[in-house]
């Protein structure tokens, strides 16, 4: 593949990454799949600066990010280390709340209306953000 040097149409460039902001809702797994099909991943927040950038674009709207604990420990979808990385949870979150009565707890993380994070039921149809790095190799064949 070739290195991606500019963002696709309708994506926003910021700090050598490209971001796409949905305007509809999907369950976390469907959002995750959508990003993968775009040769991207659900957004991985690695700094307060990136947090502010994403928050500015999504507004006060519950929005999925690429963080989940469906297999036990919290993990970022691109392998970024969770324990040592940036975190911005709401107070007393994540709480893996079972009291909703839907079966199971809460395994997927989203930005809340104030930007801080919450864990929630993964089937909820929230908006989502895809991210891809400009310097990574694209899956598309090089132009001849």
């Amino acid at each position: 593949g070739s290195e991606r040097t500019c963002c696709p149409v309708n994506w926003v460039e910021h700090e050598r990454s490209c971001y796409w902001f949905s305007r509809s809702g999907k369950a976390w797994a469907d959002a995750d799949n959508y990003c993968r099909l775009e040769d991207a991943h659900l957004v991985v927040v690695t700094s307060w600066e990136e947090q502010k950038f994403v928050q500015h674009h999504i507004g006060p709207v519950n929005t999925w990010m690429g963080l989940h604990d469906q297999n036990g420990p919290w993990k970022w979808v691109d392998g970024t280390d969770y324990e040592t990385g940036f975190k911005n949870w709401r107070p007393e979150q994540p709480d893996d709340w079972y009291g909703h009565g839907l079966g199971g707890g809460e395994d997927c993380a989203h930005f809340t209306d104030d930007g801080r994070w919450n864990d929630d039921v993964c089937q909820r149809p929230y908006r989502w953000v895809c991210e891809t790095e400009l310097d990574k190799a694209s899956q598309e064949p090089p132009l001849l």
């Epitope: 809702g25 839907l102 089937q123 909820r124 149809p125």
Partner: antibody, heavy 123, light 110 residues
């Protein structure tokens, strides 16, 4: 456990305004995680979504009722309300309030529901 | 006329397996998750299946949901007399820009 309870007059005169309130207990309406919906069921018929409101006041309405419907929220009383103007006999139905597990601009699923209140439009 | 189409009635004997269908289009079931509700006589609807195939706590595993293309179905195995009720499917619809319901299926346990 969140519970919802509808209240309001069971009889409304034609051409008047139907007004109902849904009281939410066991959880805060302003948590920011849910929509709050009104749904109705005509006697012996299926279910029809009327509209929903977010705690911030953002509303979505069924296009077929939009010109006559207003849904409002009172976070201080932990309740939301429905107003339907210019009612006719065709608005006779059981009216339910429900919590909607949707996102900002899409519906999720409705759970729980209030027990429903029958509103008859007749003079 | 409901946007989602369900058979008006279905029946079965105790212990049997019954399936209720829900047909839609690309603007609803084809693009969004389907939910199912059970309405026992004289009561409010109750969430039975959410997001195509997920059961809330307390719903027996005799109830299951599935979705394929623009159709969804609710299966009830080991039918019991207390399953006699109306069943409604529901999904978001892009044309309406809101949720739509099926017309309901009245299930009779013979």
């Amino acid at each position: 456990q969140v519970q919802l309870q509808e209240s309001g007059p069971g009889l409304v005169n034609p051409s008047q305004t139907l007004s109902l309130t849904c009281a939410v207990s066991g959880g805060s309406i302003s948590s920011g995680y849910y929509h709050w919906s009104w749904i109705r069921q005509h006697p012996g018929k299926g279910l029809e979504w009327i509209g929903y409101i977010y705690y911030s006041g953002s509303t979505y309405y069924n296009p077929s009722l939009k010109s006559r419907v207003t849904i409002s929220v009172d976070t201080s009383k932990n309740q939301f309300s429905l107003k339907l103007t210019s009612v006719t006999a065709a608005d006779t139905a059981v009216y339910y309030c429900a919590r909607d597990w949707g996102g900002y601009d899409s519906s999720g699923w409705f759970d729980p529901w209030g027990q429903g209140t029958l509103v008859t439009v007749s003079s | 006329q409901s946007v989602l189409t369900q058979p008006p009635s279905a029946s079965g004997t105790p212990g049997q397996r019954v399936t209720i269908s829900c047909s839609g289009s690309s603007s609803n079931i084809g693009s969004y998750a389907v939910n199912w509700y059970q309405q026992l006589p004289g009561t409010a609807p109750k969430l039975l299946i959410y997001s195509n195939n997920h059961r809330p706590s307390g719903v027996p595993d005799r109830f299951s949901g599935s979705k394929s293309g623009t159709s969804a179905s609710l299966a009830i195995s080991g039918l019991q007399s207390e399953d006699e009720a109306d069943y409604y499917c529901e999904a978001w619809d892009d044309s309406l820009n809101g949720p739509v319901f099926g017309g309901g299926t009245k299930l009779t346990v013979l």
